[in-house]
């Protein structure tokens, strides 16, 4: 079935109730226009946005009978010159009849004839009328036979875009058929179709056709009221493509639209061959869309590649929600233009201030205002990244000018990133050097504390992202905000003790749920004692409240836990609820406390695994005395796991070799490498080792490079030459093989000759090395440090 | 063809205000803009500014804003271009050009000889 | 004072290859198109290159416009004794808000 039919169904079933054969039809008020019910318009009670009007009438090829319900009868059959007047084209019946067309109509043959209802004659420039009645065996005769085709065509064979040869010169009649049911010959609607007749079929249609000749280009370069567009056509080179075949619509801006344009803009864009092409194609549809099709918003792909609005209000076309087509359905032999009173201008080939909407209008203000904007160069590469204008309170605008512009610059990137660009992890530098993290999560896209929302622009010189927030770049470490705040003192105290206070000073991604003193009320000195003695248990409570990784609250499907593993091992659930983040239940009462090496959110309870039983009835005590919002099982005599720490130092350790090399146990995360004099060079890339994605991590220095692996982290290491690097090279030649992997609880492992030369890029040979034995040598003191 | 013709040659004295005609043909007026350059003895061209025949705005130079005031007569397809509070350094031939605004200045009047003297 | 700089004169014999330079900012040149100018003694001028190398039509393909950055350049081969003239650059300029013109080249046909 086609559109069309199942449209007719559908009115079919809507008007059933009034007896057989009924159709519900949908009038706008206000007009004479009316329509068969589509599901969505009916549903609506309104078309292009104006209030309807339910009329039932019979469907087409049935009639009334007096006394009876509906529609029971079928409407007489007879040949297409009766028919005419069988649909009420009377006018259309008189026109065949004076012009000689009628013995032709209601002989021999098989007809489709497309005929203008009574009032589409009325609505006919007079002048072009008259010209027919005038000379009623050519002109008259011609006209009509332009409405005619040689052949039985129901709507079910009238296909979209097809192009059929019409009984005149063979002038080709173009046909649409729509989705929403609507079918046109050159834009003409059909508003009743497939009246049977024993020669052929009527279709009664809106309007008169009139003939086509001409191309799009054609229109073109005669229309004086174009010559705006037609030049910038020439310029952009399309004119000459408007010529040739298709089915295109055009959005064609009349010379008083390019003069609403601002001057300065219209020259940009005309001096720059990207820009104006751009501007060129976004009036095109390589579609060919008929004004009378047009019965709700719909979203065009245009030849530009972005999308435009086409919607209407009542009569009127509106394209991005703007009332501005002022002349419909100029129909050529290539497609249909629509005049229009506005340029359409692309993103494309805007600037990337000029992406702002009106809901970042302060932002873009103050871009201008404090002289910002000049140093967005049109032929740069910038990137916006625009908080909403809620975003800017009253004691920011009324900041120090200088401050606002630091702030200002932290929002404009140096390089143009599409949404597409944005990674978990990437660093993004802005014009005032500073570097602003992104973090990626389910639903949400977030730099620093700030998360994106929809809206995402990319213009000529830029894109632009819009944030909920001003995004502020983090200064500070994890532990040097603790330290800072007066209401973490009891969390850092046994941070400390618990030698973890490295772990939030040094480099990295974590997220940390920071219980203020509020959480340790009622903690006597003798229970902290008692948590401080047992450092396992301290060391496992406090890395519950880390959690590897940047989750910020905002980045949050609101209303879903989101389940993550702390560094303690256990989960942590957390939702976002009404702008307020839930940690196991628990109200955050602040979050997205941005920091160099992390986010703080900050809870005012103890929180503690679920999992994880205690077996000391002191602890429990204190535990229970903390925490209420979970009931902590008690195991008498378990005890808590040791974490390895290792797993979270730093990746470097330096190590000062004195005299000859001896051996070491090397724990998880551990490596030994010889001091390294000047900067590495990091390389990171992804192996697949075992079947499981590895980041590998290379340091170099000279010929030296570190292999960082999930667990464990060998070193290669050469040395320039000299007594003591021939000692090493020595050694490593010997002795390379002799590596443990340290596992907590368990025995040790050696990896197999394969083993190392995978992890080790097939770059050492390796000695196949009896399984358990442990090469361990004297300790020595050894200074430890960092990589920076 | 297109055509614009220019009033004639004016002599005025400081402070006085000229007023210079411009009559196209060849084309729809209303269609296009009209823009007003002029040309000093021996110097180069200046913008002036630019009326729309369609909707009668406006565009004029800031230099001479306040001064200039550009005018349109569909009816007989004729702009006009007065400059109030004549200087000497006014003196000048004043063109008035078709103005697409794509293209710009495609067609120029024969210029109109505007001399300021006392 | 122009806003443009253009080279005072420039010469060349019949069918030799003349470049006249026009030299902006970022506020004219750098972010708007160049149109050109003809201006033959004694007569009004003509549009010869518009969106720095557009030429209407009429004008011939021996006029050849380019720009580059903040500067724009004509380019006049097989140059004929009906090319002597001043040629004057134009382009919009953002922070006057004013279309402002060069100070014109004489070409010289010797």
């Known amino acids: 079935n086609s559109y069309y039919d199942k449209v007719l169904a559908h009115s079919r079933i809507r008007g059933r109730d009034q007896g057989p054969n009924v159709c519900a039809l949908q009038q706008i008020l206000g007009t004479k226009k009316k329509y068969f019910s589509s599901c969505k318009n009916w549903y609506q009670g309104a078309i292009c946005g104006k209030k309807t009007t339910v009329l039932y009438e019979c469907c087409p090829g049935y009639m009334r009978m007096e006394g009876m319900k509906g529609c029971p009868a079928v409407m007489p059959i007879d040949h297409v010159y009766g028919t005419l007047g069988i649909v009420g084209a009377t006018t259309t019946q008189h026109y065949s009849d004076v012009s000689k067309l009628r013995e032709e109509i209601e002989g021999k043959g098989s007809y489709t004839y497309f005929a203008p209802s009574n009032e589409a004659w009325e609505n006919l420039d007079s002048d072009i009328r008259r010209g027919l009645e005038n000379n009623v065996n050519v002109e008259l005769l011609n006209a009509l036979h332009s409405h005619m085709v040689n052949k039985r065509m129901l709507t079910k064979d009238l296909k979209h875009g097809m192009v059929i040869p019409s009984m005149y010169n063979n002038l080709g009649l173009f046909i649409n058929h729509y989705p929403n049911g609507v079918v046109t010959v050159n834009c003409a609607r059909v508003i009743h179709g497939n009246q049977i007749a024993t020669n052929g079929v009527v279709h009664v249609i809106d309007r008169v056709l009139t003939q086509i000749g001409t191309s799009i280009q054609d229109f073109l370069e005669a229309e004086d009221d174009l010559s705006s567009f037609r030049a910038a056509a020439i310029t952009s080179d399309l004119l000459e493509s408007l010529g040739r075949d298709g089915h295109f619509t055009l959005f064609a801006p009349t010379n008083e639209a390019f003069e609403k344009l601002p001057r300065g803009v219209l020259e940009r864009i005309m001096g720059d061959k990207v820009a104006s092409e751009a501007l060129m194609k976004y009036h095109i549809l390589n579609t060919l869309q008929c004004s009378e099709a047009i019965t709700g918003g719909a979203v065009f792909e245009t030849m530009e590649g972005n999308t435009i609005e086409i919607g209407c209000e009542g009569d009127s076309i509106s394209i991005n929600g703007i009332k501005m087509v002022n002349k419909k359905d100029i129909v050529t032999k290539n497609g249909v233009i629509h005049l229009i009173d506005e340029v359409l201008i692309p993103d494309s080939a805007k600037q990337v201030i000029e992406l702002a909407g009106k809901q970042q209008t302060t932002f873009t203000d103050l871009v201008a205002q404090l002289g910002l904007a000049s140093s967005l160069k049109p032929d740069g590469e910038y990137t916006l990244l625009a908080p909403v204008n809620n975003a800017f309170s009253d004691d920011t605008l009324s900041m120090d000018q200088r401050l606002l512009k630091l702030i200002l610059q932290n929002h404009i990137l140096k390089v143009k990133v599409g949404l597409s660009d944005l990674y978990n992890g990437q660093i993004l530098e802005t014009i005032g050097g500073k570097q602003l993290r992104v973090f990626v999560y389910r639903t949400a896209i977030c730099i620093e504390n700030s998360c994106m929302v929809r809206g995402s622009k990319q213009g000529r010189n830029g894109a632009i992202h819009i944030f909920r927030e001003i995004i502020q770049p983090a200064e500070k470490s994890l532990h040097d905000k603790l330290r800072q705040d007066k209401r973490f003192s009891i969390f850092l105290s046994l941070l400390e003790a618990a030698d973890l206070k490295d772990l939030l000073t040094q480099p990295g991604d974590w997220t940390l749920f920071a219980p203020t003193n509020d959480a340790f009320k009622g903690m006597t000195s003798e229970e902290r004692e008692l948590l401080i003695g047992d450092k396992n248990a301290l060391q496992n409570i406090i890395l519950y409240h880390l959690t590897p990784g940047v989750y910020i609250g905002k980045g949050f499907e609101p209303g879903v836990t989101n389940i993550l593993k702390t560094t303690q091992g256990s989960k942590i659930y957390l939702k976002g609820v009404n702008e307020t983040l839930l940690v196991n239940e628990l109200k955050s009462k602040e979050s997205d406390i941005m920091t160099t090496n992390g986010v703080i959110h900050v809870v005012d309870k103890l929180l503690y695994p679920a999992d994880i039983p205690v077996g000391n009835d002191q602890l429990l005590e204190l535990l229970n005395k903390l925490i209420k919002y979970i009931q902590i099982k008690f195991v008498r005599g378990s005890t808590f796991k040791e974490i390895p720490m290792t797993v979270y130092r730093p990746a470097m350790t330096k190590i000062q070799i004195e005299g000859d090399p001896d051996f070491r146990l090397i724990k998880e995360g551990e490596t030994v490498t010889e001091v390294i004099h000047g900067e590495p060079v990091i390389k990171k890339y992804t192996k697949i080792i075992d079947g499981v994605p590895v980041e590998i991590t290379e340091k170099q220095t000279r010929e030296e490079r570190i292999i960082t692996g999930p667990e464990i982290k060998y070193t290669r290491i050469s040395t320039g030459g000299g007594e003591t690097g021939e000692t090493l090279q020595k050694f490593l030649q010997k002795e390379v093989s002799k590596v443990t992997k340290f596992i907590e609880g368990g025995d040790g492992h050696l990896f197999e000759d394969e083993e190392i030369k995978r992890l080790l890029q097939g770059d050492t040979p390796a000695k196949k090395i009896p399984a358990n034995k442990r090469v361990q040598g004297p300790r020595r003191r050894s200074r430890e440090g960092r990589s920076q | 063809q297109v055509q614009l013709v220019q009033s004639g040659a004016e002599v005025k004295k400081p402070g006085a205000s000229v007023k210079v005609s411009c009559k196209a043909s060849?084309?729809?007026?209303?269609?296009?803009?009209i823009s007003w350059v002029r040309q000093a003895p021996g110097q180069g061209l200046e913008w002036m500014g630019w009326?729309?025949?369609?909707?009668?705005?406006?565009n004029y130079a800031q230099k001479l804003q306040g001064r200039v005031t550009m005018t349109t007569d569909t009816s007989t397809s004729t702009a006009y271009m007065e400059l109030r509070s004549l200087r000497s350094d006014d003196t000048a031939v004043y063109y008035c050009?078709?103005?697409?605004?794509?293209?710009?200045?495609?067609?120029w009047g024969q210029g109109t000889l505007v001399t300021v003297s006392s | 004072q122009s806003v443009l700089t253009q080279s005072s004169s420039a010469s060349g014999t019949p069918g030799q290859t003349v470049t006249v330079s026009c030299s902006g900012s970022?506020?004219?040149?750098?972010?708007?198109?160049v149109n050109w100018y003809q201006q033959l003694p004694g007569t009004a001028p003509k549009l010869l290159i518009y969106?720095?190398?557009q030429r209407p039509s009429g004008v011939p393909d021996r006029f050849s416009g380019s720009k580059s950055g903040t500067s724009a350049s004509l380019a006049i081969s097989g140059l004929q004794s009906a090319d002597e003239a001043d040629y004057y650059c134009?382009?919009?300029?953002?922070?006057?808000?004013?279309?402002?013109f060069g100070s014109g080249t004489k070409v010289t046909v010797l």
């Open positions: 134009a382009a919009w300029d953002d922070s006057l808000s004013t279309y402002v």
């Open positions: 970022s506020s004219d040149i750098g972010s708007n198109r």
């Open positions: 969106s720095n190398d």
């Open positions: 009326i729309s025949a369609y909707t009668g705005n406006t």
């Open positions: 050009a078709r103005d697409v605004l794509v293209v710009p200045f495609d067609y």
């Open positions: 060849g084309y729809t007026f209303t269609s296009y803009g």
